[in-house]
């Protein structure tokens, strides 16, 4: 039975040109993490394999950095980066756990909601 839960950084609103860290944490299970995949929509961004270490997809090499930990750092954000990101934990013997984070990249720090708009 899968008893674990994924905790994420939570959804993030960030400015164009900035950088953010996406992180997930698997808890409440003794299962061994064999690999963590980071995906956006249907695109693979990066893999962290317990034996082989990190692999960043070639198309994201310039803007994606591994870590901290099993997390992922996205740099030089563009509006096109807005979307849902998935951390997919492959574990033994439990199977697969998935966390979801929505990243919203905004053109400007002054939103139409008002001046006290919060961004990281």
């Amino acid at each position: 039975m899968m008893t674990g839960t994924i905790e994420t950084t939570g959804n993030i609103s960030a400015e164009k040109g900035g950088s953010i860290i996406l992180q997930c944490h698997l808890s409440s299970t003794t299962a061994q993490v064999t690999q963590v995949n980071w995906e956006q929509q249907d695109q693979l961004l990066a893999i962290c394999n317990a034996d082989l270490g990190w692999h960043i997809s070639p198309s994201f090499k310039d803007r994606v950095a591994p870590g901290p930990g099993l997390g992922l750092t996205l740099q030089s954000l563009t509006v096109n980066d807005t979307g849902e990101y998935f951390c997919i934990y492959h574990t033994y013997p439990d199977g697969t756990y998935t966390g979801r984070i929505f990243l919203e990249v905004l053109e400007s720090s002054v939103a139409e909601h008002g001046a006290r708009f919060q961004i990281p």
Partner: antibody, heavy 117, light 112 residues
Framework: EVQLQQSGPELVKPGVSMKMSCKAS????????MSWVKQSHGKSLEWIGL????????SYNQKFKDKATLTVDKSSTTAYMELLSLTSEDSAVYYC??????????WGQGTSVTVSS | DVVVTQTPLSLPVSFGDQVSISCRSS???????????LSWYLHKPGQSPQLLIY???NRFSGVPDRFSGSGSGTDFTLKISTIKPEDLGMYYC?????????FGGGTKLEIK
């Protein structure tokens, strides 16, 4: 002035699919995501999902992943939601709402869907 | 999914009253950058919902200052001072910090 104009009420038979629209005006369509919300009679609001008009990216509430399909047409600044294989459980008012910073600031007037044979 | 619990379900009021509506979440709504995406909406009969408060305490444009939001972590409050006839309706809180976004069950503000 920001406006979201939704298509009119629908009476549909069980098992069929239907597509509703949400025409946006008064702002830059691709600068905001568009959320869709369901309200069944006498119940709370439910977030169905959102679409990013800039790149077509979609985030679904898993509960609605096999029920709703979200699309946009940038040229006409219109968002669409198709509801699949309708049942009586899908009878509700559906709202589109402009969203930014994970809140919904402007809402359409709602599209009422009644599923009945 | 994050469960959002609103209390009370019904709130009978008289015009001029001050009232509070509570919204509690099953986990913290602060993200890793310290931002909390908790908003409040008023849904009047025959109308569309309208945004009152976003980011815990920020009033949306045009919203009277008799509406105020507060809270942190898992506990949030909407306060309305000096209730007016146009304030009657269903109030909902929404958490947008975690996927999927989830609404509270609603609080009906009605005349005693």
């Amino acid at each position: 002035e920001v406006q979201l104009q939704q298509s009119g009420p629908e009476l549909v038979k069980p098992g069929v699919s239907m597509k509703m629209s949400c025409k946006a005006s008064g702002y830059s369509f691709t600068a905001y995501t568009m959320s869709w919300v369901k309200q069944s009679h006498g119940k709370s609001l439910e977030w169905i999902g959102l679409i990013n008009p800039y790149n077509g990216g979609i985030s679904y509430n898993q509960k609605f992943k096999d029920k709703a399909t979200l699309t946009v047409d940038k040229s006409s600044t219109t968002a669409y939601m198709e509801l699949l294989s309708l049942t009586s459980e899908d009878s509700a008012v559906y709202y589109c709402a402009r969203s930014r910073t994970f809140a919904m600031d402007y809402w359409g007037q709602g599209t009422s869907v009644t599923v009945s044979s | 999914d994050v469960v959002v619990t609103q209390t009370p379900l019904s709130l009978p009021v008289s015009f001029g009253d001050q009232v509070s509506i509570s919204c509690r979440s099953s986990q913290s709504l602060a993200n890793s950058y310290g931002n909390t995406y908790l908003s409040w909406y008023l849904h009047k009969p025959g109308q569309s919902p309208q945004l009152l408060i976003y980011g815990i305490s920020n009033r949306f444009s045009g919203v009277p200052d008799r509406f105020s939001g507060s809270g942190s972590g898992t506990d949030f409050t909407l306060k309305i001072s000096t209730i007016k006839p146009e304030d009657l309706g269903m109030y909902y809180c929404l958490q947008g910090t975690h996927q999927p976004w989830t609404f509270g069950g609603g609080t009906k503000l009605e005349i005693k």
